[in-house]
């Protein structure tokens, strides 16, 4: 239904009444409407609602509403519907981000890496290698590196130190009667128990073998597939390595601080390989990287001399 009411707060626009040749100052129409009839010497302008599929964002003096953008192309979803006041806005569904004109899945940070910056609908996830004292044992686009379980706080000992990819394995100390107490300096073979991981301060046990300088620094040794990473970010999606190569992992050698060769100690060393058997799997996690610059938004912006 056309509306002719003019609000005191509404802006004005200049209109040439071509029939009479007169330059007139007319009241603008509210957002969501358009000028169906310009004002004349004797009448107010007439506003009509934008037809379905069209919109005007602002008060205006235009003769036709703007056409809404095309329906969202798969896999995009509607963030804002096409309505009298708003253009259709498309966005990427959860777990994806805008890359060029479409949506790409958020990068999955591989095992040994955690999320440094969460992904959004317009930005990819940023990954970082797990720092000393933390690990990530699952490929994920949402999980951060988790702190090692603090075995000591649970009156347990570290029987297998954590890596970037695995948590500490804690074990209990066996109870010794006074007659069978071990001689000083001998290592104790604990009963292993895989404890549940907790977000607690890491133990001070330092495994050796993979990275002697374990950090985010570019000097640290990195798996081949991640060799192009700068400042702890995953390489660009366009690189040829997309995670198809093996991630070469060197298993940490458990080193016992006391070097006296007692029977228990020898027993531990013998068992080590079986305890580490799960540590050397290949990682086939595809690695996708950040996109440079902003995604091209669907810019259905209009400018009209009589709008705004």
């Amino acid at each position: 239904q056309p509306e002719q009411k003019a609000s005191n707060l509404i802006g004005t626009y200049r209109h040439v009444d071509r029939a009479t040749g007169q330059v007139l100052t007319c009241d603008k129409c509210p957002a969501g409407t358009y000028v169906s009839e310009h004002c004349t010497n004797t009448s107010l302008r007439v506003c009509s609602s934008c037809p379905v599929g069209t919109f005007t964002r602002h008060e205006n003096g235009i003769e036709k509403c703007h056409d809404c953008s095309q329906p969202c192309p798969w896999p995009m979803i509607e963030k804002l519907p096409c309505a009298a006041l708003t253009d259709r806005e498309c966005t990427c569904p959860p777990g994806m981000f805008q890359s060029n004109a479409t949506c790409a899945p958020h990068t999955v940070c591989p095992v040994g890496w955690g999320v440094r910056k969460k992904g959004t609908e317009t930005e990819d996830v940023r990954c970082k290698q797990c720092a000393r004292g933390t690990f990530s044992d699952v490929p994920s686009s949402v999980m951060k590196c988790k702190a090692y379980t603090d075995c000591l706080s649970q009156n347990l000992v570290v029987i297998k130190p954590g890596t970037k990819e695995t948590d500490n394995v804690c074990g209990t100390l066996p109870s010794f009667s006074s007659s069978t107490s071990p001689s000083p300096g001998t290592a104790i073979f604990p009963r292993p128990e895989h404890m549940e991981t907790h977000e607690v301060p890491s133990s001070t046990y330092v495994p050796k073998g993979m990275n002697s300088t374990e950090s985010n620094s570019s000097a640290s040794v990195r798996p081949k597939v991640l060799s192009s990473i700068q400042e702890g970010t995953v390489p660009d999606n366009t690189s040829s390595a997309r995670g198809k190569e093996d991630v070469n992992k060197t298993l940490p050698n458990l080193q016992v601080v006391n070097h006296q060769q007692g029977p228990h100690h020898r027993h531990i060393l013998k068992l080590l390989p079986s305890m580490e058997a799960t540590g050397g799997e290949k990682s086939s996690t595809p690695i996708k990287g950040p996109k440079r610059g902003h995604p091209r938004q669907n810019l259905h912006k209009h400018f009209d001399i009589n709008e705004h």
Partner: antibody, heavy 113, light 107 residues
């Protein structure tokens, strides 16, 4: 009341120029657009262009660009149409109009050798 | 350019009759149309503008109608002074363009 008084008939040689005038009265000259229209017998009506004396803004029909020049003198409330390089095709009656409703009486231009 | 097709080009009618002249625009022009009257050897008189608005001093027997692309001028109860040429003009878009005219003659 609104009046548009046009200058008298013109006879010109091919290649020459003519300048027609249209004196406005009865309204504020600088507040309205003025148009010029050509009428040739058996050829219908053709819009030449418009001028807004308020800022001397002009707009021409592509067909008359380079041929017609529109000007205005606010002090005398008079609009002008100059036609250059005249040919027999330019023989016609030329009208000044305010909008499409108020018309001058027309000026006959005859181009002949 | 917008083409204005006017019909009929001429018609013979009697005093007191009602007649309609139509104009079709080659594209939508909303209500940006005017109707003009020209008597032989004379200038033009604006009758109607904005498709339906009657110019001051024009008799009410002249009415305009239509919107978009199809328009008409109706003259009811024709009087002797109404026999003249009639033109439509669109001013929705540059260049303004005119219909070919309709000659109204006494039968």
């Amino acid at each position: 009341q609104v009046q548009l008084q046009q200058s008298g008939p013109e006879v010109a040689r091919p290649g020459a120029s003519v300048k027609l005038s249209c004196k406005a009265s009865g309204y504020t000259f600088t507040d309205y657009y003025l148009n010029w229209v050509k009428q040739r017998t058996g050829q219908g009506l053709e819009w030449i262009g418009e001028i807004y004396p308020g800022n001397n803004h002009t707009y021409y029909n592509e067909k008359f660009k380079g041929k017609a020049t529109l000007t205005a003198d606010n002090s005398s409330s008079t609009a002008y149409l100059q036609f250059s390089s005249l040919t027999s095709e330019d023989s016609a009656v030329y009208f000044c109009t305010r909008g499409v409703i108020k018309w001058g009486q027309g000026t006959l231009v005859t181009v002949s050798v | 350019d917008i083409l204005m097709t006017q019909s009929p080009s001429s018609m013979s009618v009697s005093l007191g009759d009602t007649v309609s002249i139509t104009c079709h625009a080659s594209q939508g022009i909303r209500n940006s149309i005017g109707w003009l009257q020209q008597k032989p050897g004379k200038s033009f008189k604006g009758l109607i503008y904005h498709a339906t608005t009657l110019e001051d001093g024009v008799p009410s027997r002249f009415t305009g109608s239509g919107s978009g692309a199809d328009f008409s001028l109706t003259i009811s109860s024709l009087e002797s002074e109404d026999f003249a040429d009639y033109y439509c003009v669109q001013y929705a878009q540059f260049p303004y363009t005119f219909g070919g005219g309709t000659k109204l003659e006494i039968k």
